[in-house]
Interface confidence: low
């Protein structure tokens, strides 16, 4: 599984982080959770293995089968979403999946990030700078 | 000392919905997460969601979504649990129940449940 | 879900005696394990967490182990007031279930 090593965005506003994964796991759930360690983290949502979208809260995430990807969505953030995240997928044996760093700008600091022309407060990353972990 | 101190009995109508409070004193509200658990007559414990009091996010057991919404009130260290369109398998006691492991906490995150409320009893009935 | 599965579901024991309950989660949930004890119109009270740590206050004479999907509550010397329902539950995974419960009652 692959995904951004960090992602940016401001305070209030929202991002969007995409987790690409290989042939074989499309029918298989696909998380989102939080926590500095792996064996700790804890999930705040996830699929039941369709590509029908799940939405928690600020958090929503749906699994694009055909392009073997699925998005999570962090909406109205605050400074304590600040952490490190995992994307995931759920499997017999270990889970696998990779860590993601979620960085808050607080309002009014300036953002590194390039805005969605859609949403000026909405960031999109699909992993530019990739990592796996198993 | 460390208190949840819940709302009195409830007795509604199938298809009505019920609130039920929990006030928290005796540690700082926002630090920990609150989960809802409830048991039937006679039965077991069935965990029913959770409410972060800080940001006022939560998440729920898939069997109550839709049903249930989690809310707080910081200014009054108190945590509501409101489930509609009730039916008589609703029926039980309800209890609400401070997480062991503080959410600044970022090594654990939701271990256990280690102060309850009294409890509240729902009944439905027509 | 993870289904969670305790055994025996009720057990008949003497004061003094040794217990030994155990909770089968149907997937790894490495540690994330806790053990609660209830008592008629009571509200449950958190006794073992993350598998082994004693929760503060409670006697030395409960004890738990296990990793991933096998998991145990062991009571050294069963005293009078032990008597009560035993409740594994996870913390794995939304939802956080619950075993069914294990009522130990006086021989």
């Known amino acids: 599984i692959q995904g951004p090593e960090s992602v940016r965005a401001p305070e209030q506003g929202s991002l969007t982080v995409q987790c690409h994964y290989k042939q074989g796991w499309e029918t298989y759930i696909k998380w989102w959770c939080r926590g500095v360690r792996w064996d700790t983290c804890k999930i705040l949502i996830e699929t039941r293995g369709s590509e029908q979208g799940e939405k928690s809260d600020r958090v929503s995430i749906k699994d694009n089968q055909k392009d073997r990807t699925f998005t999570v969505t962090m909406e109205g953030l605050r400074r304590d979403d600040a952490d490190v995240y995992w994307c995931g997928i759920e499997r017999r044996g270990p889970d696998l999946g990779t860590q993601v760093k979620v960085i808050v700008d607080p309002e009014g600091a300036a953002s590194t990030t390039a805005s969605s022309p859609t949403n000026s407060n909405m960031a999109v990353f699909i992993g530019s700078h990739k990592r796996n972990h198993y | 000392q460390v208190q949840l101190v819940q709302s009195g009995a409830e007795v509604k109508k199938p298809g009505a919905s019920v609130k039920v409070s929990c006030k928290a004193s005796?540690?700082?509200?926002?630090?920990?997460?609150v989960h809802w658990v409830r048991q039937a007559p006679g039965q077991g414990l069935e965990w029913m969601g959770i409410?972060?009091?800080?940001?006022?996010?939560?998440n729920y057991a898939q069997k109550f979504q839709g049903r249930v919404t989690m809310t707080r009130d910081t200014s009054t260290s108190t945590v509501y649990m409101e489930l509609s369109s009730l039916r008589s398998e609703d029926t039980a006691v309800y209890y609400c129940?401070?997480?062991?492991?503080?959410?600044?906490?970022?090594?654990?995150?939701?271990?256990?449940?280690?102060?309850w409320g009294q409890g509240t009893t729902v009944t439905v009935s027509s | 879900d993870i289904q969670m599965t305790q055994s025996p579901s009720s057990l008949s024991a003497s004061v003094g005696d040794r217990v030994t309950i155990t909770c089968r989660a149907s997937?790894?949930?490495?540690?994330?394990l806790n053990w609660y004890q209830q008592k008629p119109g009571k509200a449950p009270k958190l006794l073992i967490y993350?598998?082994?740590t004693l929760q503060s206050g409670v006697p030395s004479r409960f004890s738990g182990s296990g990793s991933g999907t096998d998991f145990t509550l062991t009571i050294s010397s069963l005293q009078p007031e032990d008597f009560a329902t035993y409740y594994c539950?996870?913390?794995?995974?939304?939802?956080?279930?619950f075993g069914q419960g294990t009522k130990v009652e006086i021989k």
């Open positions: 129940a401070r997480d062991i492991v503080p959410m600044n906490n970022f090594y654990n995150y939701y271990y256990g449940m280690d102060v």
């Open positions: 993350a598998t082994s």
């Open positions: 539950q996870q913390s794995y995974r939304i939802p956080y279930t």
């Open positions: 409410i972060n009091p800080n940001s006022g996010g939560t």
């Open positions: 997937q790894s949930i490495s540690s994330y």
């Open positions: 005796g540690y700082t509200f926002t630090t920990y997460a």
